[in-house]
Each structure stands twice: as C-alpha cells, then as structure tokens.
C-alpha cells in the first residue's frame, strides 16, 4: 500500500491530525522535499551571519558573513575574521607573516617561499609577507 | 488540553473590514508562536498571518499584506486578526493554529477549533 504522505510536495509536511493530509510549513519552516511528516526551522543569519539567500517554504536560508569576516564549513557554518594580506590569523589576532612565508590573501595561513634551488633555478624577484618569490632560469 | 474557539466571521462586502478572534485555552499566547491560516473552496489550507516569536517577527502572507494586521492580547488570552479592504478572494473559513515545535527540531502546528467562515460577496 502507498504512503499517503508520499504525495505531500515539498513545502508542506504530512498532517497526522487531519487524517495525513498535506499542510503548508509554518512561517520561518521549510520542507525541501516531499513526504515529510514535519517541517525543519530555517536558519536565522545573526550576528557576524548576514542572509544571502531568504529561508522559502522549500528551501533553508543561506547564509555568509559581513564585511571583515569570510565563511568557513560546510553551508558557511562559521565566520572567521579576515586579515590583511602579509599575515595569518592566530589565537591572539592576526600577526604578520615571518620571514621566508607569505600569505596573499585575507585567509588562511602563511606558506613558505618556494625553494627555487630545488629546481636549479634561481630567485629572479625576492619574496615578501605578501607574495611568493619568482624563480628564474 | 489545548483548545482555540474562533469568532467573529460573516458576510461582508468588498472593501468591507471585519476583526477576527480566537480565545485559548490550554496555553499561553503570548508564550507561544500563533496565527490564522485559512481554506479556501476548494483549495487547500495556506497560512495568512502569524506573531513568530522564535524568529522575532510577524509574517504575513503576500495577498494579506497592508491590508491585515494581527495582534494579540496577552490578559484575555486571545489573538486578533483585523482584515480590511476585504476581496472575494479573502472567502475562505479562517482557522487560529499554535505552531509546534517537535523535540527532534521539527515543526507542525495544531488548528483545534472550527474555524470562523469569511465570504466576501457583494
């Protein structure tokens, strides 16, 4: 026998107090897909979190972080602060890159300088907090 | 046991306003995400207006904005819907729902009453 709920699109949940007829999700609820017997809360972009994308009846909010934040984890779980090219962001701030590293963007950490003796050449332009030296023949 | 008793529905011309009522029971309006949602003829149930105080905010639908404002109040323990500029397309019987929010995180709502029958017809 078929699931009478199968037939509840998405944006409604299955109505167990009305005999599993299909009703629309609740404000600030969404259900992305068909034959579920509750809706899910949409997400709420709070804080450092600003919405992207508006929770609809069938799809969840997106979410991504204000200016001087970038996203990280999946679906932008978390916003990490930005810092300037030439550093890296520790526990205690952003702090800049030492030397023989480099960063050239507002994340992540800084990375050494590449060895260019390694591949028998040699340094045609210094390398900075900024930028990664270029190798020459 | 949760109850919710609807009033205040009737003819009305277009253009015509009307206030509707839903007395509690059971709960705490104030305390709880509430609102109206409403059937059409033949249609199926669409959600008209709510006080939503997880996310802070009051919702209205679309085809309900500027003309449909609600309120509640907190010492009778009842919630309002005042409709104004009233169109055909507002008949429909007009249900006051709880919102429900499940342990596992999910969300229904509970419509107890009979509702109260809107016609907008000249």
């Known amino acids: 026998l078929q699931d009478p709920c199968s037939n509840c699109p998405a944006g409604t949940f299955c109505d167990n107090n009305r005999n599993q007829i299909c009703s629309p999700c609740p404000p600030n609820s969404f259900s992305s897909a068909g034959g579920q017997r509750t809706c899910d809360i949409c997400r709420q972009c709070k804080g450092v979190f600003r919405t992207r994308k508006e929770c609809s009846s069938t799809s969840n909010a997106e979410c991504d972080c204000t200016p001087g934040f970038h996203c990280l984890g999946a679906g932008c779980s978390m916003c990490e602060q930005d810092c300037k090219q030439g550093q890296e962001l520790t526990k205690k701030g952003c702090k800049d890159c030492c030397f023989g590293t480099f960063n050239d963007q507002k994340r992540g950490i800084c990375r050494p300088w590449t060895n260019c003796s390694l591949d028998g050449k040699s340094v045609l332009v210094n390398g900075t907090k900024e930028r990664d030296v270029v190798c020459g023949p | 046991e949760v109850q919710l008793l609807e009033s205040g529905g009737g003819l009305v011309q277009p253009g015509g306003s009307l206030r509707l009522s839903c007395a509690a029971s059971g709960f705490t309006v104030s305390a709880e995400d509430v609102g109206w949602v409403r059937q059409a003829p033949g249609k199926g149930l669409e959600w008209v207006s709510a006080i939503l105080d997880f996310g802070g905010s009051t919702y209205y639908a679309e085809s309900v904005k500027g003309r449909f404002t609600i309120s509640r109040d907190n010492a009778k323990n009842t919630l309002y819907l005042q409709m104004s500029s009233l169109r055909a397309e507002d008949t429909a019987v007009y249900y006051c729902?709880?919102?429900?929010?499940?342990?596992?995180?999910?969300?229904?709502?509970?419509?107890r009453g009979q509702g109260t029958q809107v016609t907008v017809s000249s």
């Open positions: 729902a709880r919102v429900v929010y499940h342990a596992g995180g999910g969300v229904t709502f509970d419509t």
